[in-house]
Each structure stands twice: as C-alpha cells, then as structure tokens.
Interface confidence: low
C-alpha cells in the first residue's frame, strides 16, 4: 500500500522515540567510526524533518524513498574521505547503487576500542543525569561494532538496559544487582548478533530460497500444529523482515516485525498453543518471546512420510507441477516430524531428496529409482549424532577450558593461514557448544549443537571474508550454507603450509596478566597455545599439553612472585627455551 | 570432463588377494579424497574405504586389516589392496572422488563416481 510519504509513514507507525533510535542504529551501522554526537545530531535532523512531513505529507521531499534520505544525510558527514576513504565513493552513486554500496562497506571487525565498563556508581551517575543520552549511546556502541544487529531486537535489549539501572541504581549493593545483570545482556547480545548475522550471511550469500528453506524447517519444528499454508505465510513475512533488516531498511523492518508479531497472536489457535503467555507481552518484549518460543508438541498420530514422498505414484507429477512448493511441503512435513535433528540436517535431506527426484523424474522407471530414497538419508542422519556423541564425551571428560583448547588445536591445525585472534575467538565459541548442548537429553542435542555451530561458523567465514587467507575456508564457506560444519570437520591437517618463523617476543609475557580476569588469562593462554601450533603444526598433544601445563605453572609462580616483572623475565626465557627444545622448534 | 576409470576386479578364491585400481582425469587429484565403495547385488551401495588428499586413511570394520587404500598423486590413481577375501565381499568395487572426507563416508552427494568394477569370491 503506498504512501504518499514513507517517512511520516514509518514515523507515526513506529512513534518518535522508536523512529529516533532505530535511525540512530541504522545510521551507526553505516558510518561505524563516527563519532556518538554527529550521529545525533543526523539522527535528529532526520527526525524534525520526518515531522514536517507528518504535518503535511506534500512538503518538500517528503516523497523521496528513505534510502534517499538517509544516504543524503550520511553523505553530508565532511569527514566521510577521511574516515572510510573508498567509502566516500559510494556518495556519488544514485539509489539504489548507493545503499547497495554502504551495505558493502560494514565492517564485521571494525578498528573500535573494546569497551570498558566503567565503574558502578560511575554509570548510574551517568544514568540519572541523562538517562536518554546514556541509553541512545548504548545503542550506539552495540550497532557500531555489531552492523547487522538485528535493529527491533536492539530495541528489546535497550528496554532491559534501561530496567536494569532504574532497578540496580537504587538499591543497596549496585553492584551487586547490576553486574551480573549487564553481564547477562552482553552474552545474549553477543548470541543474538551472531545468530543474525548468520541470517543475513543466508540471504545476501545463497538468496532468498535458501533463507526460505532455513525458515520452513525452524518454523515447522517450532509449530507442527500449523497447517502448511499457515507456515508458508509466516515463512514469506519473515523472509521479508529479515530482507529488510539486513538490508538496512530498519523502520520498515520493525514495523513489518511488529505487523508479524500481531498477526502471530490474532492467529494463535491455528499456529501454536505455545504462544499465549507471549501473546499477553507489551510489543518488544512479545516479539522477542515468539521468536525464542519452545516448540510446539507434535500432532499425534501423524501418518509415515513415505506414503505421499515415496510410495505415490504422483511424486514425480506432483514435483513437476510445482518444484519449490512440493519440495517445502517435504521439508515441513519432515520437520515437524523432528524437531530431534538439526535444521541443518533437515535440510540437507530436502537437498538428498530434491536430487534424487532430479535424477529419477527423467529416469525410465521414476518410482523403481526413488522408491529406496529414505535409505540414504540414514548415514546423514548419523554423522551428526556420531560427532556430537563423541565431542560431548571429549567435553565431559576435559571440561569447557580444556575442550576449547582441543579445538583450537584443531582448527589451528586445519585452517592455519587463519589470524591468531580470530582462530582464538572461533574456537572459544565452538567450545561453548558443550556447556551450552551437552546438558540436554539426545533429543535436543542436535538442533541445540549443530544449529549452534553453523552460527559460530558463520563468524568465522564473515571474518575471513574480510582478509582472504585460507582456500580451504573460502570453499567450506562459499559452496553450501548447510554443508559447512561437515566441511570443516572434513578438513584435516595443512599439509600445505609452511610453519610459522619463530618468534620469542611472542611467548614473552609481563606482569600485567596477573591482573586480567579468569577469561582474559585464558585467552591469553590460548593464543600462545595458537602460536605455538602455528610454530610446530605437527606438534603431538602431549607435547602441547606438556607445553600448556608448563605455561599455566610459570603464570602462577611469577603472579606470586615479589619481583613479578623480573620473574616474567627470567622464567620466560627458562620456559621459551624448554618449549622450543621440547617441540624442535 | 572429469572421468574416474577403475580396473583390477574378476573371479577370485576364498583367502585370495586382488588389487583394484582407478585412474582419474579431468580434476586436481592430490586435493581430492577418495574412496571405494561397494555394492552387493539387491544391496545398497557402502563405503568400504577412503584416502584423503594429506593421506590419512579409514575403513569400514569389514574392511580393516585386510584392505589398504593408498594413492599416487604423480599417477593420478588410487588403489585397492584386497587381501583374505570371503564370499561376502563379492560385489561391484565403485571408486569416487570428494572434496570432503565425511562426503564420501557418508555418500553425501558425491561429486564423482566410476562405472565400478566385478570383484567375485567363490567359495
């Protein structure tokens, strides 16, 4: 439906205060290294000129598309060449080339500073004196460094933000109350950028089908109740939000998302008996509530699969009619059927499923040639669950320090062009699949894990995109979304690479690590242990264990030690030559 | 055009050896895993062994310790050592080339595959 001004449109849908931060959002998205104030000040430019165009939609350019608008704004920013350089370009563009080319230049590592929580009663000071400034730079500093944030999620996170110091800045132990608070946003926050970040990878990477498929298979697990048509309807309103999200179309997101959300709970009896404590939720918090929602128990007495998908006569007409639709009901049929697998999996047994049909339909005997199909979606099936098993096992049996040094080690060994910190950071979170998935029963195992690790994977490829240094990852990245986990796992040693020169200064270690917390120590640890992989690829465990082990011991006698400064010297050089003696190096 | 070629198959006794070979053409050989694969008649085709592009080698149980997969890279081949055989391994011997390992393990859309060869036991 059109609108003779999207602008006032998208403002009156979404009101001021939801209007301002998600520009503000969007606008820290494009332009990553500009500074809180500037944004601002775009932002509220924007926003009184979206009110003159609410007051009279036939005004000046309130016709133009936002695209227009907002990249006339960015591109009014006078340090745009200095700052971003080749960026700059993308202002002599017309839309929509020119979004096109913002969207181009996000960062998924931008040059930030890390941020430093201040102390407690520093931020609540903070807080009280300008409550909105301090939130609209929460919002800043998340979107920055996280440019495909989902920006109505953002929304969500700020709320909590916002709860979490009018509650803990008034009680007795701040601290206390806040800290582990904030602590708790920054893990989901870090979850929630990663994951859709995967869902953008999806659909700028492998196009909207794929991100469709993605959908039908979580949606159908998720609301086995749902007639198809229901799900279909909700899968083509959720690829259009996302679309838009990513996409940088961020008011039209959220307001598409919240169009959703009310639609979801206007539907209820005929989606899901799930939804109802969700339903009864203020917006925010009501779309966060569906999209994390449990799934739905199955329907009882659901008939085999095989007699519409294999033992019809009509698989091959019914295929032929309508490819994508049938193929979509087989997966949602699947699906629902099992929310036990992965969503991965699923659909890699769609793929196994639409070949086999390819094949057979031109086949001189269609129902001979595909009648055995289910048979080979058996050893899809148990790769997954044979990987899990035996990497819970390594986990219960090391612990989730020990078993994401393991990883590193073999991620090291497999992809060793890869940077330090990236390789450091990939196998943190691939390691966390334990603490995360390891608890459940096996029937949650695999949707909980190998889902997991395609988003962590996706870090990985999104990183490496930036700087190429790995065919090897480039390939398990760009040949198939849903085959990357079994692609890297394929992956074994670079018999290719030639072994880091050695380097003492990078086993050189101060005194300053004593006072880092328990996680930054480890990754301390953990990028020596990189290094020294990178050093000697062919090292055994024992002798990085050895190595480990040794390094644990000389971090705590010199963190004891009165002279911390001088035993780091001296040690250092002890355990250096040890360690290059002990692996030849 | 990538073609995979294997040979070596026939009539063998029980307790017998044979050695299969499969020529590759058309693909960078030494990135490629490989595998060999069986099928028995009214069976399903199943892995048996598979050699990957750094030379780590797996079999199946039925296979362990009595085959040996190995490659020449400089001959574009990989071969089959079958040694004690039984009548249970009477079969057509595929041979089939993938980028990944767990591709050809699993018989996960396998990019290449040969014509196959006989190989029959008698007891």
């Known amino acids: 439906d059109a609108h003779k001004s999207e602008v006032a449109h998208r403002f009156k849908d979404l009101g001021e205060e939801n209007f301002k931060a998600l520009v503000l959002i969007a606008f820290a998205q494009y332009l990553q290294q500009c500074p809180f104030e500037d944004h601002v000040k775009l932002v509220n430019e924007v926003t009184e000129f979206a009110k003159t165009c609410v007051a009279d939609e036939s005004a000046e350019n309130c016709d133009k598309s936002l695209h227009t608008l907002f990249g006339d704004k960015l591109c009014t920013v006078a340090t745009l060449r200095e700052t971003y350089g080749e960026m700059a370009d993308c202002c002599a563009k017309q839309e929509p080339e020119r979004n096109e080319c913002f969207l181009q230049h996000k960062d998924d590592n931008p040059n930030l500073p890390r941020l430093v929580r201040p102390e407690v009663d520093v931020m609540c000071t903070a807080f009280h004196d300008n409550e909105e400034t301090f939130l609209k730079k929460y919002l800043y500093e998340i979107a920055r460094r996280h440019p495909y944030f989902y920006a109505p999620e953002l929304l969500f996170f700020a709320k909590r933000y916002k709860a979490a110091f009018t509650e803990c800045c008034q009680a007795a132990d701040k601290a206390a109350c806040l800290l582990p608070k904030l602590d708790e946003l920054r893990d989901e926050g870090k979850a929630s950028s990663a994951k859709q970040r995967l869902k953008c990878a999806s659909l700028q990477k492998f196009g909207e089908r794929a991100f469709k498929a993605w959908a039908v298979a979580r949606l159908s697990q998720r609301f086995p109740k749902a007639e198809f048509a229901e799900v279909s309807k909700l899968v083509t309103d959720l690829t259009k939000v996302h679309t838009e999200c990513c996409h940088g179309d961020l008011l039209e997101c959220a307001d598409d998302r919240a169009d959703l959300a009310k639609y979801i709970c206007e539907n209820q009896d005929s989606i899901s008996s799930k939804l109802k404590e969700c339903c009864e939720k203020p917006l925010l918090e009501k779309s966060h509530c569906i999209a994390e929602v449990e799934n739905d128990e199955m329907p009882a007495d659901l008939p085999s699969l095989a007699a519409d998908f294999v033992e019809s006569k009509d698989v091959c007409k019914n295929y032929a009619e309508a490819k994508d639709v049938f193929l979509g009901m087989f997966l949602y049929e699947y699906a629902r059927r099992h929310p036990d697998y992965s969503v991965v999996l699923l659909l890699r047994l769609a793929k196994t499923y639409e070949t086999t049909l390819e094949k057979c339909c031109a086949a001189a005997d269609p129902h001979e040639c595909y009648a055995k199909v289910f048979d080979e979606f058996k050893p899809l099936v148990e790769e997954p669950q044979n990987l899990i098993k035996q990497n819970c096992e390594l986990f219960e049996q090391l612990g989730e320090y020990k078993f994401q040094n393991a990883l590193l080690v073999r991620y090291t060994k497999k992809v060793p062009q890869v940077s330090t910190p990236t390789l450091v950071e990939v196998s943190r979170n691939l390691g966390k699949v334990g603490s995360k998935c390891c608890k459940h029963p096996e029937a949650k195992r695999m949707p909980c894990a190998e889902d997991y690790l395609s988003v962590v994977l996706n870090q990985l490829c999104v990183l490496h995109e930036k700087t190429p240094v790995s065919d090897r990852v480039t390939k398990c990245c760009t040949e198939s979304l849903v085959n990357r986990r079994p692609c890297f796992s394929a992956l074994e040693v670079d018999e290719t690479y030639v072994p880091k020169e050695f380097n003492a200064e990078t086993f050189t270690f101060h005194a300053d690590i004593c006072t880092l917390s328990e996680k930054e120590r480890q990754i301390k640890k953990q990028t020596a242990l990189v290094e020294l992989v990178k050093h000697k690829p062919k090292a055994t465990k024992e002798q990085l264990k050895a190595v480990m082990d040794d390094f644990a011991a000389f971090v705590e006698k010199c963190c004891k030690a009165d002279d911390k400064e001088t035993c780091f010297a001296e040690e250092g050089k002890k355990l250096v030559a040890a360690s290059q003696a002990a692996l030849g190096l | 055009e990538v073609q995979l070629v294997e040979s070596g198959g026939g009539l063998v006794q029980a307790g017998g050896s044979l050695r299969l070979s499969c020529a590759a053409s058309?693909?960078?050989?030494?990135?490629?895993?490989m595998g060999w694969f069986r099928q028995a008649p009214g069976k399903q085709r199943e892995y048996v062994a598979v050699i990957s592009s750094s030379d780590t080698t797996y079999y199946t149980n039925s296979a362990k310790g009595r085959f040996t997969i190995s490659r020449d890279n400089a001959e574009n081949t990989v071969y089959l050592q079958m040694n004690s055989l039984k009548p249970e391994d009477t079969a057509v011997y595929f041979c089939?080339?993938?980028?990944?390992?767990?591709?050809?393990?699993?018989?996960?859309?396998?990019?290449?595959w040969g014509q196959g060869t006989q190989v029959t036991v008698s007891s």
């Open positions: 089939a080339a993938d980028s990944y390992v767990t591709a050809l393990q699993t018989l996960t859309q396998i990019s290449y």
């Open positions: 058309g693909l960078s050989f030494s990135k490629y895993a």
